[in-house]
Structure formats: structure tokens, C-alpha cells
Amino acid sequence: MHSDCIFKKEQAMCLEKIQRANELMGFNDSSPGCPGMWDNITCWKPAHVGEMVLVSCPELFRIFNPDQVWETETIGESDFGDSNSLDLSDMGVVSRNCTEDGWSEPFPHYFDACGFDEYESETGDQDYYYLS
């Protein structure tokens, strides 16, 4: 499947997951906390204030770094998986905190968490794609 299609599919799946999670958690527009979101890179489930959400590195970085192997689980397609199985000390794990002011930025930032060889990538630009 073309990489553009993969990410359109991932985005669509993300919106479905968020909707299901909102129903499970009793979230609505006026609920305190952080709404689930697709940040154009990966999917983030809804969270309560004070909650840290962990995700494994998104598909984008498997395309950037095809040789990179992560020890962490890939989050399931049908739901958000078990965040408890992920650990921030693992390579390939990114977190966001839900604060009173909304979502924090990813920690670490995606490149630091997921690895990126900018020199190797110089040659592979014809395979590169844009997220829409």
C-alpha cells in the first residue's frame, strides 16, 4: 500500500479509536481533560488532567528508519492498547502529559525518541511522502 494511503488509513482509524474511547471514558466537549487527537504524526487517546499517555513510535519512523528495531509493543489497531506495557526508558516511546492547559508537547520529541539518521536520509528522498 502507498505510504500516503497508510497514513490516511491511520488517521481515519485514529478518529474511530478516539470516538470509542470518548464513549468508554464518558468524555464530551465540556469534560475536563485533554481530547484525543491526531497530531499529523500519531494518535493520542483522550486523557484526564494529570495523566501521562505513552505511545510507541509511529509508522512514519518505520519509513524514515527501516532498519530501526524497537523493543516496545505496537499499539493495537482496534483500541489504544495498554499504555502500561510501555516505558519511557525504552527507545521508541513518546509521551504527552495532559495538563490543565491541555496537551504538553511530545517527550522526548519524535526524532529523539524514535531515532533519525539525517545523513542516511539524504539519499532516500524519492521515497519520501507528505502526510496530508
Partner: antibody, heavy 120, light 107 residues
Framework: QVQLVESGGGVVQPGRSLRLSCAAS????????MHWVRQAPGKGLEWVAV????????YYAESVKGRFTISRDNSKNTLYLQMNSLRAEDTALFYC?????????????WGQGTLVTVSS | EIVLTQSPATLSLSPGERATLSCRAS??????LHWYQQKPGQAPRLLIK???QSLSGIPARFSGSGSGTDFTLTISSLEPEDFAVYYC?????????FGPGTKVDIK
């Protein structure tokens, strides 16, 4: 090596517009977020805006929101800052910087800056 | 927005002395705090990322520590080229912010 060269600065009257450019080379521009940071004469650094690698995410400092627009042309390896309704307090050296990330990141390489002077 | 406060505003020291610079955030930024050095007429240079992670090409005399709201940049033994302004920067919450800077000058 990473090179960032800003241009487009100059003297402009309050209320007028200016567009800054930043030409990037030495790295795969289309894979990195990019920032604008400014520094008023004799003052500290002020973060202005950031754009994600594909232009899909843009964020601004409150002081410029609604007046400044960050954009990029990945085919030209160029970052832009469109500045409208300029004020005297916008007078500063404007730096473009690479964000070490696809989304936002922290600035890791900086240009030498272009000076914008807003004065009547 | 998160406000970063740096102290002292100016630090007057002699070459060979130890410099300790502080950065305090108005709310937790976790470890998403980075340090930059700026010399007159030059662009800033990234020194330390994520509070304590060193970068290649940066002398080992520069080190960082802290998490949450309190951070420290330490220069173990000042070299003549270290006299400059140092800024902390948080990339934890948008809008991103910089501290006002600490100027390290020669005593």
C-alpha cells in the same frame, strides 16, 4: 553542513507588511520542523513561531498571533514569515532555526538573522 | 504560557572558576529544557538538550541538571571563550519560551 540564510529584513513603517525568507541547505529540509525566533536590540530571545515538516501544524507566540504567518516551500528548501500590521515593538533581529523534530522540536541550528526595523 | 526565570542576571567570574546558572519554570516542563550560549554578534548555539544531555562538539566542562521546575547549567572551569549570555528554553508546552538570559562576564 547545515546552513540557514535569512533575508527580507529592512526598515518598514508601522502598520505595513514584510516577508522574511530563510534558505536552507545541508540537510533534508522537508523532514524537519522550522522555527522563527527574534531578538530585540540588546534584549533576550523570543520564540515567534514553528511549522511542522509538511506545513500541517503551525503554532505562534501570543504576541504575533493573527498578524504573522509562518509557511514553507519544501520544493525550494525555503521557510517564510509573513509579517502584517507591524508595530514598533516588532523591531528585532529575526532568526530562523531548524527544529530537531518533525512536529516542533527545539532549535538546534540557527541562521545569522535578518534585521527588521519598524519605524515611522 | 510557561515563564522561565534565570538567575543571576549577571555572573562576574574569573577564568578557571566554576559557574552555576539557574533556570526556574513557572510550571513543570519535565525534562524538556534546553540551554543555549550566545556570544555578541553571533547566533545562539545549542549546548545541552533535555536538561542534562550533552551534545557532540560541546566541551565536557558544560553540564546540566534538574527536572520539573528547577534546572542548573554548570561550567566546571571557565575558559576565556565561555564569557557569553546563556539562555534556557522550554519545549514542553506551546507557546515555547526562553528565559531572559544570564550574562557571564569577566570579573
Amino acid at each position: 553542513q547545515v546552513q540557514l540564510v535569512e533575508s527580507g529584513g529592512g526598515v518598514v513603517q508601522p502598520g505595513r507588511s514584510l516577508r522574511l525568507s530563510c534558505a536552507a541547505s545541508g540537510f533534508t529540509f522537508s523532514r524537519f520542523a522550522m522555527h522563527w525566533v527574534r531578538q530585540a536590540p540588546g534584549k533576550g530571545l523570543e520564540w515567534v513561531a514553528v511549522i511542522s515538516y509538511d506545513g500541517g501544524n503551525k503554532y505562534y507566540a501570543e504576541s504575533v498571533k493573527g498578524r504573522f504567518t509562518i509557511s514553507r516551500d519544501n520544493s525550494k528548501n525555503t521557510l517564510y514569515l509573513q509579517m502584517n500590521s507591524l508595530r514598533a515593538e516588532d523591531t528585532a533581529l529575526f532568526y530562523c532555526a531548524r527544529g530537531y523534530d518533525v512536529l516542533t522540536g527545539y532549535p538546534d541550528y540557527w541562521g545569522q538573522g535578518t534585521l527588521v526595523t519598524v519605524s515611522s | 504560557e510557561i515563564v522561565l526565570t534565570q538567575s543571576p542576571a549577571t555572573l562576574s567570574l574569573s577564568p578557571g572558576e566554576r559557574a552555576t546558572l539557574s533556570c526556574r519554570a513557572s510550571q513543570s516542563v519535565g525534562r524538556s529544557l534546553h540551554w543555549y550560549q550566545q556570544k555578541p554578534g553571533q547566533a545562539p548555539r545549542l549546548l545541552i538538550k533535555y536538561a542534562s544531555q550533552s551534545l557532540s562538539g560541546i566541551p565536557a566542562r558544560f553540564s546540566g541538571s534538574g527536572s520539573g521546575t528547577d534546572f542548573t547549567l554548570t561550567i566546571s572551569s571557565l575558559e576565556p571563550e565561555d564569557f557569553a549570555v546563556y539562555y534556557c528554553h522550554q519545549s514542553s508546552m506551546l507557546p515555547f519560551t526562553f528565559g531572559p538570559g544570564t550574562k557571564v562576564d569577566i570579573k
